[in-house]
């Protein structure tokens, strides 16, 4: 039985050209996290974090994606095209798969709303 829940940063906004941290946290389960996958709105893989082996960033995003903090992901040099949904998929044993959703809005304006506590100015 899957008892866990994923907490995410929810809906966040950030400035064009700036950076933002995407964070998910799995709670209420003793399941072992084996891998976390991060995907973009069109289900493009951004990165994989394997519990034993570490991080791999997908080659196409190498210049703009940085691992961490923790199991999170940092998106850099944001463009308007980065607006959309992001998904963290937690592969766990023995529970199975948990999925969290974050919506990122990239703002043109010089002052973006600071709506997320994980955001980098």
């Amino acid at each position: 039985m899957m008892t866990g829940t994923i907490e995410t940063t929810g809906n966040i906004s950030a400035k064009k050209g700036g950076s933002v941290i995407l964070q998910c946290h799995l709670s209420s389960t003793m399941a072992q996290v084996t891998q976390v996958n991060w995907e973009q709105h069109d289900h493009s893989l951004l990165a994989i974090r394997n519990a034993e082996l570490g991080w791999h960033i997908y080659p196409a995003f190498k210049d703009r994606v940085a691992p961490g903090p923790g199991l999170g992901l940092t998106l850099q040099s944001l463009t308007m095209n980065d607006t959309g949904e992001y998904f963290c998929t937690y592969h766990t044993y023995p529970d199975g798969t948990y999925r969290g959703r974050i919506f990122l809005e990239v703002l043109e304006s010089s002052v973006a709303e600071h709506s997320a506590r994980f955001q980098i100015p």
């Epitope: 891998q35 069109d42 289900h43 493009s44 893989l45 994989i48 394997n50 082996l53 570490g54 791999h56 997908y58 080659p59 196409a60 190498k62």
Partner: antibody, heavy 119, light 107 residues
């Protein structure tokens, strides 16, 4: 059992076009990135193209961009490679491959289909 | 482009031996390296990913190691069915690139 079966390889004249297909079975096709890789007669392997699960993003080496197009039909569990303006150096064995769910590597490959470009 | 150099195109071995195949990347690729085995008339098969993780069903006599620019594939207690071509591949950066291969043959 994961199965990838390529087809469409043929003898084609320089400047011609060809469309390769790869029929996938034994797994949920729409859950995986897919690749085309080619192998020269001297056995050198060269990455040709990659495509995301839904087909929204495609990637190619600069040397092939514009001539080759990767696409997929998830309803038909089929991967395609459209090749145009073919050159003699495109003479190769073409393999389709599936990306692993554990990492960005090709965990299963088809048996290949042979393309010969010659006049 | 990142060049993957397999300096030995051929390596001779005997059944029961231990053999080490090397691969060098022209720049740092962290641990984003895979090893494939290809037997005559067959397609490549994944052996190792993440530089050291064995793919499902791969015998434990195959061991991958390395990070950065230097990588090795070690086959301990070589069996006759291991005689094949071995290719390394980096997937740290586009374009994805492969080594030219090392052919493992009997002495």
């Amino acid at each position: 059992e994961v199965k990838l079966v390529e087809s469409g390889g043929a003898l084609v004249q320089p400047g011609g076009s060809l469309k390769l297909s790869c029929a996938a079975s034994g797994f949920t096709f729409s859950d995986y990135y897919m690749y085309w890789v080619r192998q020269t007669p001297e056995k050198r392997l060269e990455w040709v193209a990659s495509i995301t699960k839904g087909g929204g993003s495609t990637y190619y080496p600069d040397t092939l961009k514009g001539r080759f197009t990767i696409s997929r039909d998830n309803a038909k569990n089929t991967l395609y490679l459209q090749m145009s303006r073919l050159k003699s150096e495109d003479t190769d064995m073409y393999y389709c491959a599936r990306q692993s769910s554990y990492d960005f590597v090709m965990d299963y490959w088809g048996q290949g289909t042979s393309v010969t470009v010659s006049s | 482009d990142i060049v993957m150099t397999q300096s030995h195109k051929f390596m001779s071995t005997s059944v029961g031996d231990r053999v080490t195949i090397t691969c060098k990347a022209s720049q740092d690729v962290d641990t984003a390296v895979a090893w494939y085995q290809q037997k005559p008339g067959q397609s490549p098969k994944l052996l190792i990913y993440w530089a050291s993780a064995r793919h499902t069903g791969v015998p434990d006599r195959f061991t991958g190691s390395g990070s950065g620019t230097d990588f090795t594939l070690t086959i301990s207690n070589v069996q006759s069915e291991d005689l094949a071509d071995y290719f390394c591949q980096q997937y740290s950066n586009y374009p994805l690139t492969f080594g030219v291969g090392t052919k493992l043959e009997l002495k």
